[in-house]
Interface confidence: medium
């Protein structure tokens, strides 16, 4: 921003009314009036070029300093060429000196040279030669100097003539201010420019209405340079929640829009499934039945819990059940759907029911499932099971209602025993088996059926309460088909698959090779 000038003294504008002091009185500098463009102009001039050494002083009136720290002095003047005078006037000069003196009071006509400090020798860029002067075409020079820091109540300027032919047409004294400024949504007051050229006055800004310094951000500051220019902005303000930047101000979000934090971003349209927001909204409330999860951004549509899984099947396979379902028809507008499976078992005899999580085994943890199927094993035979599959999403926890589908299945058989050959000889086979522990209590006996492979006419049966049996009196080097089946009070359980086991040949050494 361009510096602002505050004028303390303007000779040209005063119309000859200032009454400056000349010393020696009546000699040297003289106030003259000319007409230019039909307007009177005043000037102080001196032209004692032929009279030897000169020491003519012109002192301004006392100037009140006010708040100025550094003053700028702009001079407009003409200087005649010494060669335009007869004989070149040996004592003629083409410069004059500029002085100043500070004081806390106006000395009036009491003029003392010793109080004045020289600012500079003022030399013209262009001198007015004879031909110019005769053609009334004078060369006007403009020079500017500055002084500071000033500390007293006021000051004088003085012009010392040492034998030049000078006309002072304008003396303008001013100081500079950095103008009032709005930048980065911060207001910076009009500030007096500093006095020392290298230094910059640091000025704190204040955030405009409805703007704030962001958390962790720097307070707005700018630097007012000597020349009245603002430099080096630091920090900024941002429009607070519910407001957006419009030119240099913060304006409330329109109805139907919101802004949830102080930021540079504009207000956003309220998302789907929200209620109408008032002017200056920081968020948009959800419609009835719709919710926001704690981690949902304010710009995300409000959502609702999903509907129940669309289709659920339970397929029994021995003592296992495979549960399959399809996703809810209504996701509630979210993608974070997970499923939970719970299990209830009922005893047909008593009709008593209870949870069965502790006694069954799931192919993967039954809570937080993302897939749409799971296998449940270790089910007890002759038991009724009800499986519940619940669909949940990020806002399900905000409502009491649940979205679930159930499927029931009756387990009529035990799981087939898992059979293995423990040992063999030329005339015997040692066989063992296992079934899941929850089912063992329901088993009365195990039935082992065996026959020679290829002989479909005859077979042998052995019953035992244990988990192993040795089949004796077998033919050497012969393959036998062996199957184990659990027997329960209610009837037969599922049979194992038919295994082929071979006895050793007579040449085979060792009695029991596994």
């Amino acid at each position: 921003a361009q510096g602002k000038e505050v004028v303390l003294l303007d000779f040209a504008a005063a119309g000859g009314e200032l009454g400056w002091l000349t010393h020696p009185y009546g000699k040297g500098w003289d106030l003259m009036q000319n007409i230019m463009n039909d307007m009177p102009i005043y000037m102080y001039s001196v032209c004692n070029v032929m009279s030897g050494d000169q020491d003519n002083w012109l002192r301004t009136n006392w100037v009140y300093r006010g708040e100025a720290e550094r003053i700028f002095i702009e001079l407009k003047f003409t200087v005649r060429d010494c060669n335009s005078f007869p004989g070149g006037a040996s004592s003629c000069k083409e410069t004059f000196n500029l002085y100043y003196a500070e004081s806390d009071l106006d000395y009036g006509t009491n003029f003392q040279k010793r109080l004045f400090t020289k600012i500079d020798t003022i030399a013209p860029d262009e001198i007015t030669v004879s031909s110019d002067f005769e053609a009334r075409h004078v060369k006007l020079n403009v020079e500017e100097r500055s002084v500071g820091p000033l500390t007293r109540k006021g000051f004088y300027l003085a012009f010392q003539d040492i034998g030049a032919c000078v006309a002072l047409l304008s003396v303008r004294v001013y100081y500079k201010k950095c103008p009032e400024l709005l930048q980065g949504l911060a207001h910076f007051p009009e500030t007096i420019a500093g006095s020392d050229a290298p230094s910059l006055a640091t000025v704190a800004g204040t955030c405009v209405d409805h703007a704030v310094v962001p958390p962790g951000g720097e307070e707005p500051r700018m630097h007012c340079a000597v020349d009245g220019e603002w430099l080096v902005p630091i920090g900024q303000c941002l429009c607070q929640a519910g407001y957006e930047k419009v030119e240099d101000a913060c304006q409330a979000c329109s109805p139907g829009f919101f802004k949830f934090e102080a930021s540079e971003s504009p207000c956003l349209e309220c998302p789907e499934h929200t209620l109408p927001s008032p002017e200056g909204a920081t968020s948009c409330e959800c419609e009835e039945g719709f919710f926001r999860a704690p981690q949902d951004p304010a710009s995300m549509p409000c959502t609702r819990p999903p509907s129940a899984p669309h289709y659920l099947t339970a397929v029994g396979m021995g003592a296992k059940v495979e549960l399959r379902w399809t996703p809810p028809q209504d996701s509630g507008g979210r993608e974070d759907i997970v499923y939970s499976v719970t299990c209830e078992q009922c005893w047909p005899e008593s009709g008593e029911c209870g949870p069965c999580e502790a006694s069954v085994r799931y192919s993967e943890p039954p809570h937080g499932l993302t897939r749409t199927s799971v296998t449940v094993s270790d089910l007890e035979p002759h038991m009724n099971y009800t499986f519940t599959v619940e669909a949940r999403n990020g806002v399900s926890g905000l409502v009491t209602s649940r979205s679930f589908r159930t499927a029931s299945v009756s387990i009529n058989q035990t799981e087939p025993p898992k059979v293995r050959l423990e040992g063999r000889s030329t005339t015997s086979l040692s066989v063992s088996w296992s079934i899941p522990p929850p089912q063992q209590s329901r088993v009365w006996k195990y039935e082992v059926t065996y026959r020679k492979k290829g002989d479909s006419n005859s077979y042998n049966v052995r019953r035992t309460e244990g988990f192993s049996v040795t089949l004796d009196d077998l033919a050497p080097d012969t393959t036998y088909l062996v199957q184990v089946q659990a027997l329960t009070q209610e009837g037969q359980g599922a049979g194992s698959k038919v295994h082929e086991f071979q006895t050793l040949s007579p040449e085979g050494s060792g009695n029991l090779a596994v």
Partner: antibody
């Protein structure tokens, strides 16, 4: 100031598809949603569908299978595509800006006339 | 789908009259009711949104009221420039328009 302008083919043969572009100025398509509405000659207004600032879409359930709405935020353009046109799809087609979340249309284009005829 | 019914399809009135146009929804629409003006040249403008809020730039002679399923638009001092067709529209569940009421000068 807010402006919307539709541009379309004018004449479309039966069973062909229709593409209309709505070019907007004075607002950002990433912040505001845009609706499509049509008006058959001498009849009332019928809402076709909309595209939200975030890009998701809603359609009139009776026309959903034939409609597609998309947009290009950087070009400030919204596109309506409608398939399998019949003579009763002859209408003036308007695009309109959605106003906040008051479920209303605060600024409308001047409309583009579409005639379905062989 | 929600149906919107404007029972009066055309209405004739004199300049300076106070007129009321009504609109009924097939279910409660919780004040999500808007009114539009369509001039004979096809230009459509929003007049009233959310039952009673006047859109910017709309003269104050237009006002809206209602709740539940019944809503109305009132023009208090009819002017020549108000000759147009007026449509109501619900925004409670997607969007549907009424059939329109054509306003003419006697």
């Amino acid at each position: 100031q807010v402006q919307l302008k539709e541009s379309g083919p004018g004449l479309v043969a039966p069973s062909q598809s229709l593409s209309i572009t709505c070019t907007v100025s004075g607002f950002s398509l990433s912040r505001y949603s845009v609706h499509w509405v049509r008006q058959p000659p001498g009849k009332g207004l019928e809402w076709l569908g909309m595209i939200w600032g975030g890009g998701s879409t809603d359609y009139n359930s009776a026309l959903k299978s034939r409609l597609s709405i998309s947009k290009d935020n950087s070009k400030s353009q919204v596109f309506l595509k409608m398939n399998s046109l019949q003579t009763d799809d002859t209408a003036m087609y308007y695009c309109a800006r959605k106003h906040g979340n008051y479920y209303t249309m605060d600024y409308w284009g001047q409309g583009t006339s579409v005639t379905v005829s062989s | 789908d929600i149906q919107m019914t404007q029972t009066t399809s055309s209405l004739s009135a004199s300049l300076g009259d106070r007129i009321t146009i009504s609109c009924r929804a097939s279910q409660d629409i919780s004040n999500y009711l808007n009114w539009y003006q369509q001039k004979p040249d096809g230009t459509v403008k929003l007049l009233i949104y959310y039952t009673s809020r006047l859109h910017s730039g709309v003269p104050s002679r237009f006002s809206g009221s209602g709740s539940g399923t019944d809503y109305s638009l009132t023009i208090s001092n009819l002017e020549q420039e108000d000759i147009a067709t007026y449509f109501c529209q619900q925004g409670y569940t997607l969007y549907t328009f009424g059939g329109g009421t054509k306003l003419e000068i006697k």
